[in-house]
């Protein structure tokens, strides 16, 4: 049974091969139960976590994970060497940097060791599943009386990342956002000196090195300007 799965994890074009034993209709077996989907994310190309929902099993089961890379020099089947656990049941596998090959098709297989025929295999494009660390060291410089420049750093190659800057004043109901390319720099041309501004940034592995849809966590916020909270009617709503 070959199924195309549409998942919101950057692998919308990924095919998954599910190998389920067909059983006679009069004898329902555990091997007919679908295995949980495996979700993998590569964190800053330092390590990868592949996890599944262990609580979806009808009874606690230590599922096992194997992986390999399709049509490559790394096509030898590997056992997971570092399991992640949830309430003493396997719920994931962590792969280290040396085991990650972003640009080869990653094949991951989940198996029920008590029912070896009960297994599911997925193929993933890891370059679409990279999540960088949050931007760091946000700094603000005044370029002129009314112009601010925001700079930040990332712990990855600059050209591989794009960024999203959000800012708002204490008077704003919502964030204003601006996309920024690899240059990790943002200018706000018109700043009101009477208001206090908050800025934050997140980053994504896209588009030159990958096609990831997931953003990093937001950076720690950085503030600029007067704290006008005493006269600010929206402050408490914003902080609630």
């Amino acid at each position: 049974l070959n199924t195309t799965i549409l998942t919101p994890n950057g692998n919308e074009d990924t095919t998954a091969d599910f190998f389920l034993t067909t059983m006679p209709t009069d004898s329902l077996s555990v091997s007919t139960l679908p295995l949980p989907e495996v979700q993998c994310f590569v964190f800053n190309v330092e390590y990868m976590n592949c996890t599944w929902n262990s609580s979806s099993e009808p009874q606690p089961t230590n599922l096992t994970l194997h992986y390999w890379y399709k049509n490559s020099d790394n096509d030898k089947v590997q056992k997971c060497s570092h399991y992640l656990f949830s309430e003493e049941i396997t719920s994931g596998c962590q792969l280290q940097k040396k085991e990650i090959h972003l640009y080869q098709t990653f094949v991951v297989q989940l198996q029920d060791p008590r029912e070896p025929r009960r297994q599911a295999t997925q193929m993933l494009k890891l370059q679409n599943l990279v999540i960088p660390w949050a931007p760091e060291n946000l700094t603000l410089h005044k370029l002129s009386e009314s112009q601010l420049e925001l700079n930040w750093n990332n712990r990855f190659l600059n050209h591989c990342l794009e960024h999203l800057v959000q800012y708002r004043t204490d008077w704003d109901h919502s964030w204003t956002e601006q996309s920024v390319d690899y240059r990790h720099k943002f200018s706000l041309p018109s700043v009101d000196g009477q208001k206090r501004y908050t800025f934050r940034v997140r980053s994504r592995f896209n588009p030159l090195c990958g096609s990831a849809q997931h953003w990093s966590e937001w950076s720690h916020p950085i503030h600029w300007g007067s704290n006008t909270s005493k006269e600010n009617p929206f402050l408490f709503a914003l902080e609630a």
Epitope: K98, L102, Q127, H159, C160, E162, P207, C209
Partner: nanobody
């Protein structure tokens, strides 16, 4: 058959200009990105400029404001316009297609050209 074909290299005086071209087959050109790398003797290959299918461009700090990357979708060709050339721009320039990451064992490139020599004399 050659999948990426560079041309336009040569010998030029400092301050001069060259335009490199890289012709690709249609399926390659439709990939995620195209880029220009260079490699000087005894140095590692470095990304000079890149352009994604959607138009996003990248320039190394050392060439910003002097080099311009562009693509002609009708001709399946990517160009590198190099102005105000310096002796330190001397290298073999390679065209690449795929994802533009060549770092710590990760290689996103599907295709490389054979390279074209650029020599800038002082």
């Amino acid at each position: 058959q050659v999948q990426l074909q560079e041309s336009g290299g040569g010998l030029v005086q400092a301050g001069g200009s060259l335009r490199l071209s890289c012709a690709a087959s249609g399926s390659i050109f439709a990939g995620p990105a195209m880029g220009w790398y260079r490699q000087a003797p005894g140095k590692e290959r470095e990304l000079v400029a890149g352009i994604a299918t959607g138009g996003t461009t990248y320039y190394a700090d050392s060439v910003k404001g002097r080099f311009t990357i562009s693509r002609d979708n009708a001709k399946n060709t990517v160009y590198l316009q190099m102005n105000s050339l310096k002796p330190e721009d001397t290298a073999v320039y390679y065209c690449a297609a795929g994802y533009l990451l060549l770092w710590e064992g990760q290689d996103g490139h599907d295709y490389w050209g054979q390279g074209t020599q650029v020599t800038v004399s002082s």
